[in-house]
């Protein structure tokens, strides 16, 4: 049975050229986190695997860092990065558990006088 | 052109353990992850794990977490081990090793060059 | 664990003719998944990778499609040195799963 659950950093804003932590935590269960995969739309970004370590996708390498813990941070963004983010966190025994962030990407000015989505 | 040679055909019995090699030529050793499969007589492939020779990192199917074992000789640089004990009759099967096709990475990694394969029997 | 059932367990076709076969994951694994082929005795042997991408020296009849949960191996006019089994699998989450394999063999 999944007893577990995503907390998330929900819908969040950031600047254009400014960068981002994406975070997510598995809470309520004591299932053995294996793999998270972080993935936007249908894109795989990043695999953390607990025995191995990260994987970055060649495509996003100078863009994405990896961490802080199993979250990651997105650099140099642009409005192209606005979107749907998931975290995929492969468990044992438990299965598959899956967040959703939205980010929003702003232009500078618009940034500065308010964001639609503030961070937790 | 790359080559996976694996060692010979093993009999065992029930709570020994086996070590299979398998040595590797053709290309950077250190730069390919390697896998290893198994296929019990009659039945389709099973992963049972992955070993990065150029760190020793290795990450094992839950089934056989415990029992398996993976290592790479240090000194030559050419060859990778996989030890399963604690065996029992289950355990007959075909052991393959298998390259990971992308350098320096575990993904996307798809099983480019396959040895030959190594039959281990536990009567 | 990501589970890949594979159907039909045994597909019987002459030769010449067509062969489909089929590939479901337990759930998505986008188009991260690879084809094999293994004969009697021998070692599987690479065919397509990233679900349609055929490896260095596969012929063209072997064709590969789908994306995310259903995948189909295409070969377009056995030859009789396409009678073989024939494994998909997944490679973005550990542990790397198989399917129980598809066997073609002749009519």
């Known amino acids: 049975m999944m007893t577990g659950t995503i907390e998330t950093t929900g819908n969040i804003s950031a600047e254009k050229g400014g960068s981002i932590i994406l975070q997510c935590h598995l809470s309520s269960t004591t299932a053995q986190v294996t793999q998270v995969n972080w993935e936007q739309q249908d894109q795989l970004l990043a695999i953390c695997n607990a025995d191995l370590g990260w994987h970055i996708s060649p495509s996003f390498k100078d863009r994405v860092a990896p961490g802080p813990g199993l979250g990651l941070t997105l650099q140099s963004l642009t409005v192209n990065d606005t979107g749907e983010y998931f975290c995929i966190y492969h468990t044992y025994p438990d299965g598959t558990y899956t967040g959703r962030i939205f980010l929003e990407v702003l232009e500078s000015s618009v940034a500065e006088h308010g964001a639609r989505f503030q961070i937790p | 052109q790359v080559q996976l040679v694996q060692s010979g055909a093993e009999v065992k019995k029930p709570g020994a353990s086996v070590k299979v090699s398998c040595k590797a030529s053709?290309?950077?050793?250190?730069?390919?992850?390697m896998g290893w499969v198994r296929q019990a007589p009659g039945q389709g492939l099973e992963w049972m794990g992955v070993i990065n020779p150029s760190m020793g990192a290795t990450s094992y199917a839950q089934k056989f977490q415990g029992r398996v074992t993976m290592t790479r000789d240090t000194s030559t640089l050419s060859t990778v081990y996989m030890e399963l004990s604690s065996l029992r009759s289950e355990d007959t099967a075909v052991y393959y090793c298998?390259?990971?096709?992308?350098?320096?990475?575990?993904?996307?990694?798809?099983?480019?060059?396959w040895g030959q394969g190594t039959m281990v029997t536990v009567s | 664990e990501i589970v890949m059932t594979q159907s039909p367990a045994t597909l019987s076709v002459s030769p010449g003719e067509r062969a489909t076969l089929s590939c479901r994951a337990s759930q998505s694994v986008s188009s991260n998944l690879a084809w094999y082929q293994q004969k009697p005795g021998q070692a599987p042997r690479h065919l397509i990778y990233g679900a349609s991408t055929r490896a260095t020296g596969i012929p063209a009849r072997f064709s590969g499609s789908g994306s995310g949960t259903e995948f189909t191996l295409t070969i377009s006019s056995l030859q009789s040195e396409d009678f073989a089994v024939y494994y998909c699998?997944?490679?973005?989450?550990?542990?790397?799963?198989f399917g129980g394999g598809t066997k073609v063999e002749i009519k």
């Open positions: 053709g290309y950077t050793f250190t730069s390919h992850y």
């Open positions: 298998a390259r990971l096709h992308v350098s320096g990475s575990y993904y996307p990694a798809y099983l480019d060059y």
């Open positions: 699998q997944q490679y973005i989450v550990f542990p790397w799963t």
